[in-house]
């Protein structure tokens, strides 16, 4: 007789999830010498322990503490790049500008990026069929709790000038309901962070508007200013040229506005 299994509204655990996490951990520790001490089997055991045999709507930050402990690393606090709704360009940027870090350039962010996972209460099985959706099912699911926890701590770790890349093609360039708008903005520490600098990325080739004047950007400025952090904003009119100029800053065409 097949056991009754809870059906959730979201996609199930990413196939080959354990193998993927372990392989990513090994790759990360090979590329980053300062993380060579990390035992990837222990990392996987801690990751698994955060959600296996637990109800997938009842996950807490504490469940991830053992994983957090194993994944602790030195991230230069003044080289942090946050992003909202423009992940690919942010990652392309840090792949070129190697001294800057998005959350996904840290071990924990790298392990979990683009993956889904959940378990089932009282069984050691991983649920590959379905996982809770944040809106339709519950917010305290394994994936949402993980990202909320690491996003908060990433913002708390930031200092001096923090950069955020925002998508100028969206109707809400700054969205209060995004992870950046609901978690990271509110966890920047005024005693450590001097300035938040927004980079608004333009989508259209002939788009010459000043998107720093957008009402949602003004709303972000207001929130940040109230937290005693300075705010600045730059338009990135040509993201392709922007990346090219990060790669080759000496290029003569890189002195003009991008």
């Amino acid at each position: 007789v097949p056991r009754w299994r809870q059906q959730w509204s979201g996609p199930g655990t990413t196939k080959r999830f354990p193998e993927t996490v372990l392989a990513r951990c090994v790759k990360y520790t090979e590329i980053h010498p300062e993380m060579r001490h990390v035992d990837c089997q222990s990392v996987w055991d801690a990751f698994k322990g955060a959600f296996i045999s637990k109800h997938p709507c009842n996950i807490t930050e504490e469940d991830y503490q053992p994983l957090m402990k194993l994944g602790t690393q030195t991230v230069p606090c003044n080289k942090i790049l946050l992003w909202s709704r423009i992940k690919d360009l942010a990652h392309q940027f840090t792949q070129v500008q190697r001294d800057m870090f998005t959350l996904e350039d840290t071990l924990l962010g790298y392990l979990a990026d683009d993956l889904t996972w959940c378990g089932e209460f009282n069984t050691s099985k991983i649920n590959y069929q379905s996982c809770p959706d944040w809106r339709k099912d519950c917010s305290n699911n394994p994936v949402s709790v993980f990202w909320k926890t690491v996003s908060r701590r990433f913002a708390e770790a930031a200092c001096d000038v923090v950069h955020v890349m925002l998508n100028g093609s969206r109707s809400k360039i700054f969205d209060k309901n995004s992870t950046f708008g609901s978690v990271e903005v509110h966890n920047l520490q005024p005693e450590k962070v001097q300035t938040l600098e927004a980079w608004v990325i333009h989508g259209g080739r002939e788009d010459s508007r000043d998107l720093c004047q957008d009402p949602t950007i003004k709303e972000l400025e207001s929130i940040i200013s109230k937290r005693n952090i300075q705010f600045s904003c730059k338009n990135i009119y040509r993201p392709d040229k922007f990346l090219q100029c990060v790669k080759n800053p000496e290029d003569s065409s890189c002195t003009s506005e991008i």
Epitope: Q73, P76, R153, K192
Partner: nanobody
Framework: QVKLEESGGGSVQTGGSLRLSCAAS????????MGWYRQAPGKQRELVVG???????NYADSVKGRFTISRDNAKNTVYLQMNSLRPEDTAVYYC?????????WGQGTQVTVSS
């Protein structure tokens, strides 16, 4: 893997001075916020002073004008010079580095101020 070790604690009379040191196992002061915290018996751990790589310093009101933080990047050491000590400064003093996602703490050094 960053490790922190505090030293310099001890017993002193009211009005006396002590200099605490926090030695880091790696060169981190140009990359991480550092802080001195203290915990008195039966109380919560509290921030005494923090410093970020740019040099901005944030002192707790209770120690302003009496305590000074400094760092020696070449020696991977951060210092806390404590002057005009008071009995209420009695606590275990901890050094902290803001690693991600969890901070890294030293084991602490006891400071006792008697009247």
């Amino acid at each position: 893997q960053v490790k922190l070790e505090e030293s310099g604690g001890g017993s002193v009379q009211t009005g006396g001075s002590l200099r605490l040191s926090c030695a880091a196992s790696a060169s981190i002061f140009t990359r991480l916020p550092m802080g001195w915290y203290r915990q008195a018996p039966g109380k919560q751990r509290e921030l005494v002073v923090g410093i970020v790589p740019s040099g901005r310093i944030n002192y707790a009101d209770s120690v302003k004008g009496r305590f000074t933080i400094s760092r020696d990047n070449a020696k991977n050491t951060v210092y806390l010079q404590m002057n005009s000590l008071r009995p209420e400064d009695t606590a275990v003093y901890y050094c902290r580095a803001d690693t991600f996602p969890l901070p890294t703490w030293g084991q602490g050094t006891q400071v006792t101020v008697s009247s």
